[in-house]
Interface confidence: low
């Protein structure tokens, strides 16, 4: 007899993973057999859709491979022509364990800044999503929240949120980890310990300490009135982040020195700077007392001016006489390089004798200062353009070096040759001039260079001396 | 990177001469001064001679002077020990070392490997 | 002419801090004696470790520091490690017409 449909098994719920596969049952009873149709959210399913497999003449549905997007709700309706259709619906939940769709990335940031770490998922039922730092679940606090999309939010970084993070999505189907991210915080360079200022006496060491730190951990470059450091050694260490920076100095002049610490944050770099001074004692007095000792002058820049062996002095003041002395002419001697070709021999005689006096070794070791007419011949005739020039320069304070004025002697202070010839040392390299002897008397040298003209005697010489600095 | 290595070592009759050179590479190496150092056989440091960065002075252990000559060619960046008049008691390992500075003394901040001098009949 | 002395040896135990010193047999050192320390292991050439008294050289861990006590200049390892284990010597610059650097005897450093 005929029979209407009645579906005996009324469609479930069904919970299905992704890729697996799912079926839905639609027991029919009815005579003649029904024709069952499927539909998805009201949307009729196709026979010929291959996603999906229909038998047992309509009443199983299989979904082949499960996606995220068969959920839905899903019908089956039986007809036969006999009474009305009739229809059972059940719904499909796709289950998935958690996925990571967006996982985080490293991050570089400067302190103070907030950072975003993102950890955006998919998951049914919706997953959880914690954070890992290093080894350790991160708790959250006033300055760290896990947002609701999952993403880790850091309000004012600081130095301690750096590290190694990861993210984890977990629901009842299973746990996803991120990959290990860093979030570097980056701090602007700021120096911890600044240079101290000191006072010392010409030739003697000084070492200038300058401490800073930062992340990167900053490169530290010194800096000498100005320019970049040109002589001293530098002798640096790191450690935890610090850089610790030690120059040390011969010092021969005074200076403004200044640590710089540099740290670059992408293409922007952040310094900070410290200065010290370093300013010589009794720089601007005459050294009184004669303390120090006879030695052959054993140096180089000198050795073409001074008579071989030479007996010079050696100023004990100076923690290295020798060196001292000796870098002294060398500064000085340099500067000589531009002057006119009459001056410069001269120049260099009076400086070579100037800085190593020659001297009379006794009880007492004793300098012997240049005689006053030969100093009066350099800088009234032979080089009186230039020193008019120094002397200028000097009182406009243009002097890129103050070296020059204890390797320059005062004229006027000088002994004269005529008071007494002993007391005095001459000059081999400026010899008299053989038509007009009146001068200069007489005397030997195996190294003559220039003629001395007929100088102006230095009582009626109208250059006026300005007052320099003798190292003796 | 700063290396300095010795050469010239060997072994000598008393009396006889040597000429170490130190060759140094990886820095300015006519801004700095530079000394010898030797140590005998299970003995300790011992100072032997010095030259500021440019030559200008010579510096030498008492025991030494006269004998031995410290010299520098700032072009070839090689220091030089020429030893002359040898005695046993030279016998040592040479080390050749790079001043923290300009002038001839103070901090040794660098040194060679060392190049062994045995002056032996 | 003066002798620079120096401990024979000294044993520490690592974590432990011990102090080596350097002076003159005749006379005080002084900062003008600019105070240098160097470190010898066996077979190795030596190593700067501090200059002119305090000043660390460049990779010098902080665990050594130097200064000037009483007379003596002095080395002191805080937190000694077994590595630190070797030789150390002092050397003063002796300012005089002959113009000496002197080293030390030098002081067997045992970590035990």
């Known amino acids: 007899l005929p029979k209407a449909p009645v579906i005996t098994t009324p469609l479930e719920t069904v919970d299905a993973l992704v890729e697996e596969v799912a079926t839905f049952m639609c027991a029919v009873e009815s005579y003649p057999q029904p024709e069952i149709s499927w539909t998805r959210n009201k949307i009729l399913i196709k026979l010929f859709d291959t996603r999906y497999s229909i038998r047992e003449n309509g009443q199983l549905l299989t979904i082949l491979s499960v996606e995220d997007s068969d959920d839905g709700i899903y019908c089956c309706t039986a007809n036969n022509g006999v009474g009305g259709a009739v229809e059972s619906c059940g719904a499909l939940q796709v289950k998935m364990k958690p996925k990571i769709t967006r996982p985080p990335i490293n991050v570089k940031i400067i302190e103070g800044l907030k950072a975003v770490l993102p950890c955006t998922t998919m998951g049914n039922p919706k997953p959880s999503v914690s954070w890992i730092k290093g080894d350790s679940p991160l708790r959250e606090n006033s300055r760290t929240a896990v947002l609701e999309s999952g993403s880790l939010r850091i309000h004012n970084v600081q130095k301690e949120d750096a590290g190694q993070y990861r993210c984890v999505a977990k629901n009842s189907l299973g746990t996803a980890y991120s990959k290990v991210v860093k979030l570097e915080v980056e701090v602007f360079a700021r120096i911890l310990r600044a240079p101290e200022s000191h006072n010392v006496t010409f030739g003697s060491f000084v070492t200038l300490h300058c401490t800073a730190t930062g992340i990167p951990v900053p490169t530290i470059t010194w800096i000498e009135n100005g320019n970049a450091v040109s002589s001293g050694s530098i002798q640096e260490s790191v450690k935890d982040r610090v850089i610790d920076s030690r120059l040390q100095l011969f010092i021969t002049k005074p200076g403004l020195y200044t640590c710089i610490a540099t740290n670059k944050h992408g293409e922007k770099f952040s310094t900070a700077k410290a200065a010290a001074t370093v300013s010589i004692a009794e720089w601007s007095k005459p050294q009184k007392d004669n303390k120090g000792y006879c030695a052959q002058y054993r140096g180089e820049v000198c050795n073409a001016v001074l008579a071989k062996d030479a007996l010079v002095f050696l100023n004990t003041s100076y923690a290295d006489p020798e060196e001292a002395q000796e870098l002294l002419v060398h500064t000085a001697w340099n500067e000589l390089k531009v002057v006119s070709p009459l001056c410069r021999p001269a120049a260099e005689a009076l400086l070579c004798n100037h800085v190593f006096q020659e001297c009379s070794p006794g009880v007492v070791p004793t300098p012997i200062p240049i005689c006053r007419e030969y100093c009066l011949a350099v800088k009234e005739l032979f080089c009186a353009k230039e020193w008019l020039a120094m002397e200028e320069k000097t009182h406009r304070g243009l002097y890129r070096s103050e070296m020059h004025l204890l390797s320059v002697p005062e004229c006027s202070k000088l002994p004269s040759m005529h008071w007494d010839p002993t007391a005095c040392a001459r000059l081999p390299h400026l010899d008299y001039n053989k038509e007009n002897p009146k001068t200069f008397p007489p005397m030997t040298s195996s190294k003559p260079s220039v003629d001395i003209p007929n100088l102006p005697s230095s009582s009626s010489s109208s250059f006026s001396v300005s007052p320099t600095y003798s190292m003796t | 990177e700063l290396q300095l290595v010795e050469s010239g070592g060997g072994l000598v009759q008393p009396g006889g001469s040597l000429r170490l050179s130190c060759a140094a590479s990886?820095?300015?190496?006519?801004?700095?001064?530079m000394s010898w150092v030797r140590q005998a056989p299970g003995k300790g440091l011992e100072w032997v001679s010095a030259?500021?960065?440019?030559?200008?002075?010579?510096y030498y252990k008492e025991s030494v002077k006269g004998r031995f000559t410290i010299s520098r060619d700032n072009a070839k960046k090689t220091l030089y020990l020429q030893m002359n008049s040898l005695k046993s008691e030279d016998t040592a390992v040479y080390y050749c070392?790079?001043?923290?500075?300009?002038?001839?003394?103070?901090?040794?901040?660098?040194w060679g490997q060392g190049t062994l001098v045995t002056v032996s009949s | 002419q003066a002798v620079v002395t120096q401990e024979p040896s000294l044993s520490v135990s690592p974590g432990g801090t011990v102090t080596l010193t350097c002076g003159l047999s005749?006379?005080?050192?002084?900062?003008?004696?600019?105070p240098d320390w160097y470190q010898q292991t066996p077979g190795q050439a030596p190593r700067g470790l501090i200059y002119?008294?305090?000043s660390r050289h460049s990779g010098v861990p902080s665990r050594f520091s130097g200064s000037i006590s009483g007379n003596k200049a002095a080395l002191t390892i805080t937190g000694a490690q077994p590595e630190d284990e070797a030789d150390y010597y002092c050397?003063?610059?002796?300012?005089?017409?002959?113009?000496?650097?002197?080293f030390g005897g030098g002081t067997k450093l045992t970590v035990l």
């Open positions: 002119s008294t305090d």
């Open positions: 070392a790079k001043r923290s500075g300009r002038i001839a003394f103070g901090a040794l901040d660098a």
């Open positions: 005749s006379g005080s050192v002084t900062a003008s004696n600019y």
């Open positions: 050397a003063l610059y002796m300012y005089s017409d002959s113009k000496l650097y002197v």
């Open positions: 030259i500021p960065w440019n030559g200008g002075s010579t």
């Open positions: 990886g820095f300015t190496f006519d801004d700095y001064g």
